[in-house]
Interface confidence: low
């Protein structure tokens, strides 16, 4: 029988009343063009939503948006347009919402094409109150607050021109001109390349990387024969231009840019790529493409330092720059990560890893379905996950996989069981053990969130019709029960709940349509009754992450240590309620060679735990260049990985000698650079 | 200049299969879906089914399913589709179509359509005793 | 599967003058529909996508318009060249759908 529909599944009490009583419809007074959701700050309730209409009239398009705002996580709202003076709001900047909880917002208005410069509108309390400004620039980029001070904001113009202010957008200066691409980095630093010559396009490759620490008073050149830059942790990396051809290479600086290493990574041509898929303080996941327009790469994992790599996996699915790949941090459990590769055959199969890179397999076959027609042996196959790529393949799968860091061990994800993905009509899988093992959940394509970190799954199926009809589970996905939230069914557009899957308020959004209008609609349905009391300490479980062998002393050992979480059980109906905290425990293990990567030189044979050294290397010094310096690496092949936290045990030898000689490439070595002052 | 060059006309017998090429130039082939639509003589465009060049997955019509079988060699950028089991209601003109809502040009989630913009000059299959 | 409903099934018209065709589907295909002309012995050609956007190449008499289930081709003052017959595409959900087509003659 389909998953929540047998003997076992025990019906919550009395729900459809809790339910009715708790449900709140909003029709909005537009008639539908688009809309956008922006919640503001955290806990606050608050949410904006700006629709805009477009009527295309003779000569030009009339646009016309309105802006409203909720204060109970949807269930009512007002309409703010008169806040913003009625302006035209230009969707393609979305909505800016300040870092944390600092209650900011600026919207970006249209303006008349014989302009000055743009218009804003800002608030500070949460969009209770707007400020209209005009600039004196046109914008290119939406506004980007600083992460440490959210009322410092850059901006590009559409001139090229680098502008910030230093009180929440009331006033603005032009600190560059000529400026590419400008990001904000640590302690209210910016990074930003800029042009000489003619463009940002016809330049690409002899871009300089630029620095300022105090808003734009002086500056410093840290890189020329710039292609692109990208921060990602406590990295800072640029792709830089070889001297001698068209190829470019990876450096890495983890001090700002005032010292930088090439990293040891294959150089790319001018049709392929880099691509940062994910990195903390730790360590980095990158992706480089492969030669020719194959639609794949490798990724590389690297050390503490963003400069020794080591091979992760090869054949990684990645279209083109800026296209589709799979990569999907499993935020639900430390060290998983989901991506597809392009096996020889062409078909596209997903990989899991459990320790951050180190080694990748096929997801387990869930129990309770079986292998399609994909597969060549009916018993043998693996879960397959559509992620982006499916998306944009337009195969039916509404919704990427979903993970909550605070709804442990949960990932939820569109999957088809064969020995590839399949473009047959996907199902709803979960794994409650961070990927380990998998069962199907739902029949078909959903959209689905999670709610109470965990306490409630909702889901609504994928229907070209429309729908009046919302699922949910208590119990991680093992029973679901069906809820009619309107008598009159709406054409369906989204799903929206708090990000951080700590509330209990589920808005459902869609549009009416009749034979002369159609309208904006949105249902907020508030759990908090369904869930009548709060989790007690009963209701908890300990549970061990990644165990695979309880009789293993060194079970659940991930990156040189294991965590025990308290768990909800499946069968408590409770609140973990917005104040939840995973709780867990985590304990130290002993080293093994598992804890180590591979060390520049070395490799690791498949299904082997040693390293050993690359025929090319052999009997060769280990040389490599260090903050421009020569080093001698004196290693019998091990590094330990970044954020492993073993102790005792397994003890490789490990020494790096300064050799006082110099060597750059073609970046420019410290000394070398330049200051200047504004 | 973008073109799609298909094979040339074929005569079959009821109960046979066809295998009808097209070939791609002037563009990156594996950035491009590839449709495949037919029609009967003086009846209507029908689609077939299409074709991801980069994974070399498929989707067809219903009513094809089963009997139709469609590739693709991207080291000569050819797509190729297979009809077997012929009968007469076959005898069709066959055309392979680029199709643009494939890979690189749409971000994940959008639900805009491009249009097949680019279409082979047809290939003749009659099916006959 | 979405069915296509193309009138008229035949449309006669004089040069110079404005044609309007009409598509209809049987369910909601949002703006995914695009419109392709054909002559005789010749492969379709692609006029419009995205219901309302103009292909390259392709003259501004032409113009689409219509989202979800309605949909309006309309060439503004008909040409000796556009006489042909026009067709109808949904790629909203698989299998993408034809319309039966609406051939455009001279009065």
């Known amino acids: 029988s389909a998953p929540g529909e047998d003997e076992e599944c025990g019906r919550v009490r009395d729900f459809v009343a809790k339910l009715a009583n708790n449900t709140h419809q909003h029709v909005f007074d537009d008639l539908r063009g688009s809309v956008s959701l922006s919640w503001v700050g955290d806990s606050t309730g608050v949410i904006l939503v700006l629709t805009t209409f477009h009527v295309p009239l003779v000569i030009m398009t009339f646009g016309q948006s309105k802006l409203y705002r909720s204060e109970d996580y949807g269930k009512n709202f007002k309409d703010i347009t008169d806040l913003i003076n009625n302006t035209f709001i230009r969707t393609e900047f979305g909505m800016a919402i300040g870092p944390e909880n600092s209650g900011k917002v600026v919207l970006t208005a249209e303006v008349s094409g014989g302009s000055r410069g743009g218009r804003i509108f800002r608030s500070s309390d949460f969009a209770k109150n707007f400020v209209q400004t005009d600039l004196p620039f046109h914008p290119l980029t939406q506004m980007m607050y600083s992460p440490q001070n959210s009322d410092y904001l850059l901006a590009l113009s559409t001139e090229n021109g680098l502008w910030v202010s230093k009180n929440f957008g009331g006033k603005w200066e032009e600190i560059h001109k000529a400026v590419c691409l400008a990001k904000w980095g640590s302690d209210n630093t910016i990074f930003f390349t800029t042009y000489a010559n003619g463009s940002c396009k016809a330049d690409l490759g002899a871009l300089e990387l630029w620095r300022t620490s105090d808003l734009g008073k002086s500056f410093k050149t840290i890189g020329v024969k710039i292609y692109s830059f990208g921060l990602g942790g406590r990295f800072l990396f640029a792709s830089v231009m070889a001297d001698k051809d068209t190829t470019r290479r990876i450096h890495v600086s983890t001090d700002q840019g005032d010292t930088w290493s090439m990293a040891q990574l294959p150089s790319v041509g001018q049709e392929q790529f880099y691509s940062i898929l994910a990195a903390n303080d730790d360590m980095v996941f990158m992706h480089v493409d492969e030669p020719g327009d194959t639609g794949f790469g490798t990724i590389f994992t690297s050390d503490d330092r963003g400069i020794v790599y080591s091979k992760s996996l090869d054949r990684h699915l990645y279209t083109t720059t800026g296209g589709e790949t799979d990569f999907t941090n499993v935020t639900s459990l430390r060290g998983v990560y989901i991506t597809s590769v392009l096996s020889e055959d062409n078909s596209i199969q997903t990989m899991i890893t459990f320790d951050q890179g180190g080694r990748w397999t096929h997801l387990r076959k869930p129990e309770n379905s079986e292998c399609d027609a994909t597969a060549k042996n009916k018993n043998e196959c693996s879960l397959h996950i559509h992620a982006s790529y499916s998306i944009s393949q337009k195969l039916n799968v509404p919704m990427a996989p979903l993970s909550e860091p605070n709804a442990v061990g949960i990932v939820i994800a569109h999957g088809s069981v064969g020995d590839a993905i399949s473009v047959m009509v996907p199902d709803v899988y979960i794994s409650d053990d961070g990927g380990y093992s998998w069962t199907k959940m739902l029949e078909g394509p959903h959209y689905y969130t999670i709610l109470d970190s965990g306490g409630i799954i909702v889901a609504i199926e994928h229907s070209s019709r429309p729908i009046n009809v919302i699922k949910f589970s208590t119990d991680e996905g093992q029973c679901w029960q069906t809820y009619t939230f309107t008598r009159d069914p709406i054409y369906f557009t989204g799903l929206a709940s708090e990000p951080g899957a700590r509330s209990m308020n589920i808005s459902i959004w869609g549009f009416t349509e009749s034979f002369l209008t159609s309208q904006w609609v949105s249902y907020t349905i508030d759990f908090k009754d369904i869930l009548e009391r709060n989790c007690e300490e009963k209701d908890y479980t300990i549970w061990l992450a990644h165990s695979t062998d309880p009789e293993d002393y060194e079970d659940g050992c991930i990156l040189g240590y294991k965590e025990q979480f308290l768990r909800l059980r499946k069968s408590s109906v409770c609140q973990n309620g917005r104040d939840y905290v995973v709780t867990k425990q985590p304990s130290i293990c002993l080293c093994s060679l598992e804890d180590f990567l591979c060390d520049f030189g070395y490799y690791r044979p498949e299904n082997d735990s040693k390293c050993v050294e690359q025929p090319e290397l052999k009997g060769h010094d280990l040389e490599f260049c260090l903050y421009g310096r020569e080093e001698h690496l004196t290693t019998n092949g091990y590094r330990k990985i970044p954020g492993d936290k073993c102790q005792g045990g397994v003890n490789p030898v490990r020494e790096v000698k300064d050799l006082k000689k110099k060597c750059t490439s073609n970046f420019l070595s410290p000394e070398k650079q330049n200051s200047k002052s504004n | 200049q973008v073109q799609l060059v298909q094979s040339g006309a074929e005569v079959k017998k009821p109960g046979a299969s066809v295998k009808v090429s097209c070939k791609a130039s002037?563009?990156?082939?594996?950035?491009?879906?590839m449709s495949w639509v037919r029609q009967a003589p003086g009846q209507g465009l029908e689609w077939m089914g299409i074709i991801n060049p980069i994974g070399g997955s498929t989707s067809y019509a219903q009513k094809f399913q089963g009997r139709v079988t469609m590739t693709r060699d991207t080291s000569t950028s050819t797509v190729y589709m297979e009809l077997s089991s012929l009968r007469s209601e076959d005898t069709a003109v066959y055309y392979c179509?680029?199709?643009?809502?494939?890979?690189?040009?749409?971000?994940?989630?959008?639900?805009?359509?491009?249009?097949?913009?680019?279409w082979g000059q047809g290939t003749t299959v009659t099916v006959s005793s | 599967e979405i069915v296509m409903t193309q009138s008229p099934a035949t449309l006669s018209v004089s040069p110079g003058e404005r044609a309007t065709l009409s598509c209809r589907a049987s369910q909601s295909v949002s703006s995914n529909l695009a419109w392709y002309q054909q002559k005789p012995g010749q492969a379709p050609r692609l006029l419009i996508y995205?219901?309302?956007t103009r292909a390259t190449g392709i003259p501004a008499r032409f113009s689409g318009s219509g989202s979800g289930t309605e949909f309006t081709l309309t060439i503004s003052s008909l040409q000796s060249e556009d006489f042909a017959v026009y067709y109808c595409?949904?790629?909203?959900?698989?299998?993408?759908?034809f319309g039966g087509g609406t051939k455009v003659e001279i009065k």
């Open positions: 595409q949904q790629a909203r959900l698989g299998p993408w759908t």
């Open positions: 995205g219901a309302s």
């Open positions: 179509a680029r199709d643009p809502s494939g890979i690189a040009l749409l971000g994940p989630a959008s639900r805009y359509y491009y249009g097949m913009d680019v």
């Open positions: 002037g563009y990156t082939f594996t950035k491009y879906y």
